[in-house]
Interface confidence: low
């Protein structure tokens, strides 16, 4: 119950809070658990002792294994367990597992990712921040105090964040890093009663007889995920499918695109080799979500060819 | 608010049929657009068919041909009539409803549909 895991890179610095807490007037005293040997409270030492804290300063892969810190008072005794892991820096990117701090959630109205432990040292800002080992460059990114706020959240920003701080200790520098993972996480959406930003209502479009034509509907229906949004065409009334005209077909697939942060939806109708009768048919685009249904229609007229009369 | 009530769940076997019904009390369904979702186990909630005032229909695409769905403006109740079921049609399903004033769905309970032989 009282035991901690911790870990950290070697040849960075490394600090360790007792799992046992304590009144700051207490005592405690640090062990390394193996040999039973007491952790020395001078600073001198490369591994010391300073309250409730044992600092690695800088930390070495030979450092790991179980310490004890027993947080004395006039009446009691607590003892605590620190299992602390120091790992070979990695030659390459990844960052594994076994180093990554808990993974945060953000979204667009919340998108603080704070550095984990940073608390523990002794460090001044700004802070460095990386995402899959790149540097973060641009406007979005904002190192405040110790967290990173990233405007304009989308999708493509999760991914692991890496931490990159100097802490000080008399005067002397060494380098902490620390990653965790961040996944975006849609807003709370809602729906609306759908929108239809293309066609216009009673639209004409021009074709020219023989080519081939395409008509969009493309409707919008709020935010976040939607439960149920369909956009669709319709002639004269009648399902594409259902009406039988093999030149005339809708786009397979829905591309579901998020403008503003809004879920809208497109549909494309394909008429190859546009012909007369096309001119006498009703195009309806159709947008319908359980508010409801929307419809605005389109007709046909044939495009007059460009006079080249000098 | 309308108070959703879904009944007609149960056991069935692999290409048998159910008739799911959804009684809504409250309100007239006919202010309503109705819905009917199902959640498997582990997975997310998702659309299987909807019904508008004007009776146009829409169907998720794993369920078309298979699915309908109706409604019975007399009797308050929405239906989804199952056939040809497949055991990955398992699920808890859920009736909804939403006006066109609204922006919120109000939900049923759920009752649970088990295709197994």
């Known amino acids: 119950k009282f035991s901690k895991q911790s870990w950290g890179l070697e040849n960075e610095a490394l600090i360790v809070r007792c799992p046992r807490q304590g009144k700051p007037s207490y005592t405690v005293d640090w062990y390394y658990s193996q040999t039973n040997k007491s952790i020395p409270t001078q600073e001198r030492n490369r591994v010391f002792a300073s309250g409730q804290l044992l600092k690695f300063l800088p930390a070495a892969v030979a450092d790991s294994g179980i310490y004890t810190c027993i947080v004395r008072s006039p009446t009691f005794n607590r003892t605590g367990y620190a299992n602390v892991t120091i790992y070979k820096k990695q030659s390459d990117c990844n960052v594994p597992d076994y180093l990554m701090y808990s993974t945060v959630s953000g979204s667009e109205k919340n998108s603080k990712i704070y550095c984990p432990t940073i608390d523990l040292y002794n460090w001044t800002a700004p802070l460095e921040w990386f995402k899959n080992c790149q540097a973060l460059q641009g406007s979005r990114y904002r190192a405040h105090k110790s967290f990173l706020v990233i405007d304009n959240v989308m999708t493509e920003d999760a991914g692991d964040y890496t931490c990159k701080f100097i802490h000080n200790e008399n005067g002397a520098n060494y380098s902490v890093t620390a990653t965790r993972s961040f996944t975006v996480k849609d807003e709370q959406g809602f729906s609306l009663f759908p929108v239809i930003g293309a066609p216009a209502q009673n639209e004409i479009k021009e074709v020219e007889i023989g080519k081939n034509a395409n008509l969009t509907c493309s409707a919008c229906f709020g935010k976040g995920t939607q439960f149920l949004a369909a956009v669709l065409w319709q002639l004269n009334g009648t399902k594409i499918t259902d009406f039988g005209e093999p030149r005339i077909q809708q786009e397979e697939g829905q591309n579901q695109s998020f403008s503003n942060g809004l879920a809208c939806l497109d549909m494309v109708l394909r008429i190859a080799d546009v012909k007369e009768e096309d001119l006498l048919l009703q195009y309806d685009c159709l947008a319908l979500n359980l508010h409801g249904l929307r419809r605005h229609t389109v007709r046909l007229s044939r495009k007059n060819p460009i006079d080249h009369h000098s | 608010e309308v108070q959703l009530v879904e009944s007609g769940g149960g056991l069935v076997q692999p290409g048998g049929s159910l008739r799911l019904s959804c009684a809504a009390s409250g309100r007239s369904i006919s202010d309503y657009t109705m819905g009917w979702f199902r959640q498997a186990p582990g997975k997310e909630r998702e659309f299987v068919a909807g019904?508008?005032?004007?009776?146009?229909?829409h169907y998720a695409d794993s369920v078309k041909g298979r699915f309908t769905i109706s409604a019975d403006n007399s009797k308050n109740t929405a239906y989804l009539q199952m056939n040809s079921l497949k055991p990955e049609d398992t699920a808890v399903y859920y009736c909804a409803a939403v006006s066109s004033n609204s922006e919120t769905f109000d939900w049923g309970q759920g009752t649970l549909v088990t295709v197994s032989s």
């Open positions: 019904i508008w005032s004007g009776g146009y229909t």
